[in-house]
């Protein structure tokens, strides 16, 4: 019996087609992805093959103005239109709190939403009961397939799930649910979830009875043969893991942003064992036409976005200096504003020991593309912020050793004075450079804001200590020459859309007046 699994993950609000790098589509003939194009391909496969499941491994939420405005209603609507068969909860599904998941998505989805390792407690338990499930048995043709879900246990550090959801260890939580499916005579089981490729492989290895793992979170691109676009494969598709009980378990992921549709064919024997698996992600490029009905609907929904982008978010009573003449040479108040917003967006998980889990921000000055003039009645709009941060990136959370941070700050000024983009703006950091010294030895003082303290204060950076830092995904991926961050980071979790982070902060503060205050000397 043959099953076709179509899968997406980490779509992050890319409802419209995008450019090849998943930013805003400029030249339509070269654009990719989007739900209208995805629909065309999915329908084509459904017409051609009998047993097709369409699955999503989480993080539909967060990433473009679509999510900012529609807050998840757009996800439910277009996933319903595509007739998804199941979705696993990702960490970003909790970005607007549990209410922001329940109302627009859980209550409106016409498909099961899954996670076996999230347990509700207290008053939330009855409110959310039945709205998401640990697993679902789906009839497919004349057979049944069990889908069991999982979500990153780091979600409380990455999003806003509140205090009434407990995120258990994935493997510990999955095993009893898989065992339950086995007792229900379900012998074909897919683990669908959002914990990253390393955890996906562990699940394949450790959870007895899981036949296939469909993952997300790490934006992993797998491919067999010559890859069709810019993404470099992290391994073959499917990636085969030998389980502890000797089975060959295919593990798949489909990069991110709706650029590819994962396509996996699995052949099962009559006892539900995987005999063979093969496939590849399908690049959703312009050779696949956008479905006219979905496209027309996208255009209808778009109208509200255009109106939103010119509305006032808040006011500034000072000039927001985002000029390259400032931000690539010295501390600039636009850099301070953005870093303060980045930290504010990550205020979560305080306890008796820690006032917050992260206190530091770094931001390449070259990523700040425009100032905002306060003389326009002080008005700040989404449109203004899109000029400051035009690349559609995210502000991510990484863990780095102090020694890596020191290298990053040396890199920041290694060729100072040439108006290059790597000059770092900061938050929760005081850095002093001596530019008379030779490159690679210019950082003379580097103090960082404590987190394990009741009164935050600046202490000298310790080379062997592990620190959490918020930074643009561009830097986490080694951009602007920050190869040491990419090579030495100990953990990397994708965060929220850059413009959204700053706009939320401005809306919250209502009136802003960031200063140049001696963070960089």
């Amino acid at each position: 019996w043959e099953l076709t699994i179509l899968h997406t993950n980490d779509v992050h609000s890319r409802l419209e087609q995008t450019s090849e790098d998943s930013s805003k589509c400029v030249n339509a003939s070269r654009c990719m992805g989007g739900v209208a194009r995805l629909f065309t391909k999915v329908q084509q496969i459904r017409r051609a093959e009998p047993n097709v499941l369409l699955l999503d491994a989480g993080d539909q939420y967060q990433g473009t103005i679509w999510f900012t405005v529609y807050k998840g209603a757009e996800v439910a609507h277009f996933m319903n239109a595509l007739r998804y068969d199941a979705m696993a909860l990702g960490n970003h599904e909790f970005d607007n709190g549990v209410e922001g998941l329940i109302e627009p998505l859980l209550k409106e989805a016409k498909f099961p939403i899954l996670s076996a390792n999230i347990k509700a407690k207290g008053p939330l338990a009855s409110q959310i009961s039945g709205l998401y499930l640990p697993y679902k048995v789906l009839p497919v043709g004349d057979e049944v397939v069990g889908i069991v879900g999982y979500t990153s246990k780091e979600t409380p550090f990455l999003s806003n799930p509140g205090t009434n959801l407990v995120f258990e260890d994935e493997i510990t939580a999955l095993q009893p649910e898989v065992d339950k499916l086995k007792t229900l005579n379900v012998n074909k089981i897919i683990a669908l979830g959002h914990s990253g490729f390393e955890t996906d492989k562990l699940i394949a290895q450790k959870v007895r009875g899981v036949d296939v793992v469909v993952g997300g979170h790490s934006n992993t691109f797998l491919y067999t043969g010559n890859p069709p676009s810019k993404e470099v494969p992290a391994g073959k598709y499917p990636f085969i893991v030998t389980s502890d009980d000797g089975r060959k378990v295919p593990v798949v992921q489909a990069y991110a942003f709706g650029k590819y549709l994962g396509y996996l064919k699995i052949e099962f024997d009559e006892r539900g064992n995987v005999i063979s698996s093969h496939g590849n992600p399908i690049l959703l490029n312009s050779s696949i036409p956008e479905d006219p009905s979905i496209k027309a609907d996208i255009n209808k929904w778009r109208i509200k976005l255009d109106n939103y982008s010119t509305q006032e978010l808040g006011k500034t009573i000072v000039y927001l200096d985002g000029s390259s003449q400032s931000c690539r040479f010295r501390e600039c108040n636009m850099g301070n504003l953005i870093c303060d917003a980045m930290i504010n967006n990550n205020l979560r998980h305080a306890d008796e020991m820690f006032w917050n889990h992260v206190s530091m921000c770094i931001l390449n000055g070259g990523g700040i593309r425009s100032p905002i003039d306060e003389r326009n009645n002080g008005t700040i709009t989404w449109e203004n912020l899109a000029a400051v941060l035009p690349f559609g990136g995210t502000f991510d959370l990484v863990q780095l050793k102090g020694s890596t941070l020191k290298k990053a700050f040396e890199h920041s000024v290694h060729r100072y004075g040439q108006s290059t983009g790597e000059f770092l703006q900061v938050g929760g950091i005081h850095v002093v450079y001596d530019l008379s010294r030779k490159p690679g030895d210019r950082v003379v003082k580097l103090d960082v804001l404590c987190t394990k303290c009741r009164v935050p204060s600046y202490d000298p950076l310790k080379m062997d200590e592990i620190y959490k830092v918020i930074l643009p995904n561009f830097l986490a991926n080694g951009g602007d020459g920050f190869q040491m961050i990419k090579d030495e980071l100990l953990r990397h979790d994708s965060g929220d859309q850059d413009i959204n982070v700053v706009s939320t902060y401005i809306s919250k503060m209502k009136v802003i007046y960031p200063a140049v205050e001696g963070r960089i000397k």
Epitope: Q43, R47, H77, N80, R83, D85, E108, P139, V140, I294
Partner: antibody
Framework: QVQLVQSGAEVKKPGASVKMSCKAS????????MHWVKQSHGKSLEWIGY????????TYNPKFEGRATLTVDTSASTAYMELRSLRSEDTAVYYC????????????WGQGTTVTVSS | DIVMTQSPSSLSASVGDRVTITCTAS???????LHWYQQKPGSSPKLWIY???NLASGVPGRFSGSGSGTDYTLTISSLQPEDFATYYC?????????FGAGTKLEIK
Amino acid sequence: QVQLVQSGAEVKKPGASVKMSCKASGYTFTDYNMHWVKQSHGKSLEWIGYIKPHNAGTTYNPKFEGRATLTVDTSASTAYMELRSLRSEDTAVYYCVRSDFLYWYFDVWGQGTTVTVSS
Amino acid sequence: DIVMTQSPSSLSASVGDRVTITCTASSSVSSSYLHWYQQKPGSSPKLWIYSTSNLASGVPGRFSGSGSGTDYTLTISSLQPEDFATYYCHQYHRSPLTFGAGTKLEIK
């Protein structure tokens, strides 16, 4: 043109089962979900559930779960509904209905199958 | 479940009258997923208005629909003989899909 043609009227005894059919034509059968709706005499409409013809995935109204079974034969572009353990209150007209995929309205209705349950 | 309450349950009116039928949802429904059907005796229901205000193909312009949140209306600006029928509202914003009990429009 797009149409749904349903099987003829049925008379059944309480406790029996009935299986009715709905033949689709004029469109690609797998592209649209097929719903089933009950209408008792002089009464309103009651949703039973729907099936995705491309993979036979089903969603039921909890009220009918376990007693109604929806299936398809894609090669014949035909949907079926079986209703088991019939009782007198199952006497009704049953419609198969195609739904729009964007806003889920019912744009094409079958002519209905009348089921009478009587001892 | 979202309960759809239609009022009135029946209505006697004359040709040329302006008629309004209301449908109230027990909790908020997106206007995109609120639809109306017309049914005449011995026939299957027909899609009449979809997504609150869009007339289905072949529906005369004297019909209109409006509303948001929990309150929706179907209006006939000038009643014609062929409009006497039963009208049902329907939501599939949230599962399970539900219908109103119907409004029967009769000749006075």
